[in-house]
Interface confidence: low
């Protein structure tokens, strides 16, 4: 009679993470008598996966009933596969012996490859805000995928970015891999509503890539432009001066009026108007009683935006252009929170 052969018909098996792997194995003879064991790997460091004779293997089930006398099918199923299960599995026939069974014949092995989906890409931007024209870096990370081949792309508002560097780790063989990419993006004044998207494509995703996003509103600071103007005279000796603060982002802004270099009033931007591009406009105004002044007045609108150094714009108010009334009240009425008399 021909000597027993152990046949593993599948050289390789590919399974998605979370699924069940079937590892096939048959023997060509019932003789010699003895159990089958399954191992991952070969040599002295091999790992026991299943022992027909004894032990508890909760993830492993046999395809056929190994207790039947004429059974020659020793295939197994391994449930809830993870990337850590990848490797070459050997079906090994043992001959009954005393005191221990003796290894008799091994199958050629079946390589189990595990396909694992990448985790959702996480995009993170710089810790500090940056202004338009500056280049900022964004990072994208995704983990736990297998096989190693993966494609990563960056987009800004649908336009593919080109200035990025990507690494897949580890370089050598591993049960699963991680990808890390850093992209450089040049900010523009219109980027408050912009998005940066990291897109990851992998064989496990079946053409439906994963995306991570970052809003540039969390990254950009658009500094304001200031314009100080003198409005028409509201009353004979009152002048309305406005400070237009335009196109700034984020909203955090504090404005200080100075009269000849002395602080007159400080206020925080509250009721702002939003522009289509996401930036804000705000206006502060000051009611100046010119009769309280003998000389020209230098009015300065000083703005501190988002904790940055203050910027300012000045306006020279010509007192001589406004005739003073003798005995007029130096305390002009204060008609609103944005109005202030200057003394």
């Amino acid at each position: 009679e021909e000597e027993l052969q152990v046949i593993q018909p599948d050289k390789s098996v590919l399974v998605a993470a979370g699924e069940t792997a079937t590892l096939r194995c048959t023997a060509t003879s019932l003789i010699p008598v003895g159990p089958i064991q399954w191992f991952r790997g070969a040599g002295p460091g091999r790992e026991l996966i299943y022992n027909q004779k004894e032990g508890h293997f909760p993830r492993v089930t046999t395809v056929s009933d190994l207790t039947k006398r004429n059974n020659m099918d020793f295939s197994i199923r391994i449930g809830n596969i993870t990337p850590a299960d990848a490797g070459t599995y050997y079906c090994v026939k043992f001959r009954k012996g005393s005191p221990d069974d003796v290894e008799f014949k091994s199958g050629a092995g079946t390589e189990l490859s595990v396909r694992a989906k990448p985790s959702a890409p996480v995009v993170s931007g710089p810790a500090a805000r940056a202004t338009p024209q500056h280049t900022v870096s964004f990072t994208c990370e995704s983990h736990g995928f297998s096989p190693r081949d993966i494609t990563l792309k960056w987009f800004k508002n649908g336009n593919e970015l080109s200035d990025f560097q990507t690494n897949v780790d580890p370089v050598g063989e591993s049960v699963s891999y991680s990808i890390h990419s850093t992209a450089k993006v040049v900010l523009t004044r219109e980027d408050v509503h912009s998005q940066v998207i990291c897109e990851v494509a992998h064989v496990t995703l079946q053409g439906d890539p994963l995306r991570g996003t970052a809003n540039l509103s969390e990254t950009i600071r658009v500094p304001p432009t200031l314009e100080v103007t003198q409005q028409p005279v509201r009353a004979e000796n009152q002048v309305n001066v406005t400070c237009q603060v335009r196109k700034f982002y984020p909203q955090r802004l504090q404005l200080t009026w100075l009269e000849n270099g002395n602080v007159s009033r400080t206020e925080t931007a509250s009721t702002v108007t939003e522009n289509k591009d996401g930036t804000y406009n705000w206006m502060s105004w000051l009611l100046v009683n010119v009769s309280a002044h003998r000389d020209d007045v230098k009015l300065t609108c000083q703005v501190e935006h988002d904790g940055q150094p203050a910027v300012s714009k000045s306006h020279d108010l010509k007192v001589s252009a406004h005739p003073k009334e003798q005995g007029s009240n130096t305390a002009a009425e204060n008609t609103g929170s944005n109005e202030r008399n200057i003394y």
Epitope: K156, N159, S162, Q165, T166, K184
Partner: nanobody, 126 residues
Framework: QVQLVESGGGLVQPGGSLRLSCADS????????TGWFRQAPGREREGVAC????????RYTDSVRGRFTISRDNARRTVYLQMNSLRPEDTAVYYC???????????????????WGQGTQVTVSS
């Protein structure tokens, strides 16, 4: 202003090859995403191929994919377009362009590219 200069054009038979070069007289081409575009008589200018600043990303229009290869030598600050298996319909003036914003990679339109060379004529004819 970046000054791009193309070279390598000429007359070639169908099935032949040409290699176009694009260099910058100010030697700054390595800082920018760069594209090759072409314009045939009576037709709109179209993107042919483009390459990122680092050279790690390339893109081709469908009609040239597999026949043309874009590459760059940043040490020489030169971008190349290797054109194989040329066809009569490849006849056009070929332009090199740089995207000075550096971070777009787009060949679908040439609006992102804001610095252009004068062009080099490529004629494919028997």
């Amino acid at each position: 202003q970046v000054q791009l200069v193309e070279s390598g054009g000429g007359l070639v038979q169908p099935g032949g090859s040409l290699r176009l070069s694009c260099a910058d007289s100010e030697f700054r081409l390595d800082e920018y995403a760069t594209g090759w575009f072409r314009q045939a008589p009576g037709r709109e200018r179209e993107g042919v191929a483009c390459i990122s600043r680092s050279g790690s990303n390339t893109r081709y229009t469908d009609s040239v994919r597999g026949r043309f290869t874009i590459s760059r030598d940043n040490a020489r600050r030169t971008v190349y377009l290797q054109m194989n298996s040329l066809r009569p319909e490849d006849t056009a003036v070929y332009y090199c362009a740089a995207d000075l914003t550096s971070h777009y990679l787009s060949c679908s339109s040439y609006t992102d590219y804001n610095s252009w060379g004068q062009g080099t004529q490529v004629t494919v004819s028997s």
